[in-house]
Interface confidence: low
């Protein structure tokens, strides 16, 4: 065993030592006292617990007067059952030569462990959990030893490992669920999980290599709300929040997938919203709609979360106002950048604001369009002026680069090149 394992090996030796009772000739397997174990079809030795090693004893089945093995067997304090089968399971009594009770032993038959089935999952980028289950029935009391280490290799010598790589125990669920959790994991590191199934007849280990990137599966988004848009019988506004389990860090954002369908409709429509809100524009008037959302790491690590619980909404009733021409939809507010303390604030909808469309007659419509045209023109003029100013400043710099601080107010400090604008 490598030196990095010495701490763990000392613990295991201490456990093994504690299991051997000094006052009895019988090693006590962990589990209920007085139970001994064997394998069907194999020879099984039972040990009389209340005597000195080698003392001759008589053996009986509990409740049966027939002597199974006498004190003259030459086997001392042990009873040997050849080719044990289920009929041998049960309670045995051993007595010393003077008739005193040496103890009772219950025999239970079963099998050594097989390698457990292990899988790991992560709901965020800092912690992951592993679950396990027996791959085959052993029929015996079973426990699991769980540990992990970081797969970091130092230099060219692949045998040399940094002491900081473990192994460390993987703390098991205190409520007894077959689960352990690794806290404070590194997103870019590889880990090796060790789950050892132990029963009184042996141990069997499963090693599983995991990386957080591949097992990452966020919890579904929370707080999904679906609201009608007054005056728009084909619109619904859906909004939601990040799952509570997702840590608030600006560098690990989530992207979303939204599905919706009218009641009784078999097929979902799918969209990928850019933020924490989406306006559905092709809802069926008068029908309730189911909506659900799913989340995934924005750089596509891992997999999509399960779907959130469905939320329902019905578009508002009322006359459908005349829509403005499609080009009017270009005149929307610029998207708000995420702030450092907020993973992805609700963005303004990419649809025109409903109030813009709530016109009483075509005169108002024309007035609004004219205003939009003027605003557009002024925007273009302002843009041209800004461009000219920027070019002038650029030429004025000694090295031809922008002056320090220029545009600093519009480039967020936490935005990395190539990161999507969520």
């Amino acid at each position: 065993m490598s030196s990095s394992c010495s701490g763990l090996s000392r613990v295991l030796v201490a456990v093994a030592t504690a299991l051997v009772s000094a006052s009895s000739p019988c090693p006590q397997a962990w589990g209920p006292p007085g139970v001994q174990y064997g394998q069907p079809g194999r020879s099984v030795k039972l040990c009389c617990p209340g005597v000195t090693a080698g003392d001759p004893v008589s053996w009986f089945r509990d409740g049966e007067p027939k002597l199974l093995q006498g004190p003259d067997s030459g086997l001392g304090h042990e009873l040997v059952l050849a080719q044990a089968d289920s009929t041998d399971e049960g309670t045995y009594i051993c007595q010393t030569l003077d008739g005193a009770l040496g103890g009772t032993v219950t025999l239970q038959l079963g099998y050594p462990p097989a390698r457990p089935v292990v899988s790991c999952q992560a709901a965020d980028y800092e912690n992951f959990s592993c679950t396990w289950s027996p791959s085959q029935i052993s029929g015996l009391p079973t426990r699991y030893l769980t540990s992990y280490r970081k797969k970091t290799v130092l230099g060219a010598d692949s045998q040399r490992r940094s002491p900081s790589t473990g192994p460390w125990p993987c703390p098991q669920d205190p409520l007894g669920a077959a689960r352990c959790v690794v806290h404070g994991a590194e997103f870019w590191s590889q880990y090796r999980i060790n789950v050892t199934e132990v029963n009184p007849l042996g141990a069997s280990t499963r090693l599983l290599d995991v990386s957080l990137q591949s097992i990452l599966r966020p919890d579904p988004p929370q707080g999904l709300r679906v609201e009608s848009v007054p005056g728009y019988p084909r619109r619904l506004r859906a909004s939601w929040t990040y799952p509570a389990s997702w840590p608030c860090q600006p560098h690990f954002l989530l992207k979303f997938r939204l599905q919706y369908r009218p009641a009784q409709h078999p097929a979902w429509s799918t969209v990928e919203p850019a933020g924490l809100e989406e306006v559905i524009t092709d809802a069926v008037a008068g029908l309730p709609h189911a909506v659900r959302v799913s989340a995934r790491d924005f750089l596509d690590a891992g997999t999509w979360s399960t779907w959130s619980p469905e939320a329902w909404g019905t578009p508002s009733t009322g006359t459908i106002p005349k829509e403005i021409p499609a080009w009017g939809q270009l005149h929307t507010q610029p998207e708000v950048e995420p702030q450092v303390d907020s993973p992805a604030p609700p963005r303004p909808s990419l649809q025109p604001h409903p109030r813009l469309l709530d016109h009483r007659d075509s005169v108002e419509q024309v007035a609004v369009l004219a205003s939009l045209g003027i605003l557009s023109f002024l925007g273009l003029v302002a843009g041209a002026l800004a461009l000219g100013l920027w070019l002038r400043l650029r030429r004025g710099g000694k090295d031809g680069s922008p002056k320090p601080g220029f545009l600093a107010s519009v480039i967020p400090v936490d935005r990395r090149p190539g990161a999507p604008n969520l």
């Epitope: 080719q83 289920s86 009929t87 399971e89 049960g90 239970q108 085959q136 029935i137």
Partner: antibody
């Protein structure tokens, strides 16, 4: 001969619990595993778990770990299964079944009880 | 979980015919001890299931010798050499090599 006796039916309200019994006779109760199996019309058979009466050791189907609790009363050679937080999904026939051996291990269901029909209804 | 797939789901026969039911598992049923724990049960209407064959090919006590089981690994077959009226019902295969123990969906043997 081996017999496993179960009550015919139980009617319970949603959210309540029910304790089913299976009285064994005709063999040494403590020597064989006792299994429980759920049967819903059109949904086939589902193994719930098993208990070794001599030691009380249990092995559950993960799906039923929270729903079912298996116990035995050795003095009356009776196995029990408690089902909790009942919903309409739990309406089914529940069979107890005794394991079999032929000198080597293998939990097949050698003898079955007639089954108890559990109906969950308000 | 190990998935047990039975075919056919319905098998119409005439009395005296030979009948054959197939059962396929999603993974090998060979236990680490070398045994294969694949079993067959018959459930007649209004009754609980009854064990016919255990460990692939062993007939349970009292089961007529017209019933036989065969197969290995993941593919198994139950054959009835000459169907009698008392054989009609639903046949289930089951595995107990892996936890949880699982059953096939059943094959209904019925008269044509």
């Amino acid at each position: 001969q081996v017999q496993l006796q179960q009550p015919g039916a139980e009617l319970v309200k949603p959210g309540a619990s029910v304790r089913l019994s299976c009285k064994a006779s005709g063999y040494t109760f403590t020597s064989y595993w006792m299994h429980w199996v759920k049967q819903r019309p059109g949904q086939g058979l589902e193994w719930i778990g098993m208990i070794h009466p001599n030691s009380g050791y249990t092995n559950y189907n993960e799906k039923f770990k929270i729903k079912a609790t298996l116990t035995v009363d050795k003095s009356s050679s009776t196995a029990h299964m408690q089902l909790s937080s009942l919903t309409s999904e739990d309406s089914a026939v529940y069979h107890c079944a005794r394991g079999g051996y032929d000198g080597s291990y293998g939990p097949w269901f050698a003898y079955w009880g007639q089954g108890t029909l559990v109906t969950v209804s308000a | 979980d190990v998935v047990m797939t039975q075919t056919p789901l319905s098998l119409p026969v005439s009395l005296g015919d030979q009948a054959s039911i197939s059962c396929r598992s999603s993974q090998s049923l060979v236990h680490s001890n070398g045994n294969t724990y694949l079993h067959w049960y018959l459930q007649k209407p209004g009754q609980s299931p009854k064990l016919l064959i255990y460990k692939v090919s062993n007939r349970f006590s009292g089961v007529p010798d017209r019933f036989s089981g065969s197969g290995s690994g993941t593919d198994f077959t139950l054959k009835i050499s000459r169907v009698e009226a008392e054989d009609l019902g639903v046949y289930f295969c089951s595995q107990s090599t892996h936890v949880p123990l699982t059953f096939g969906a059943g094959t209904k043997l019925e008269l044509k």
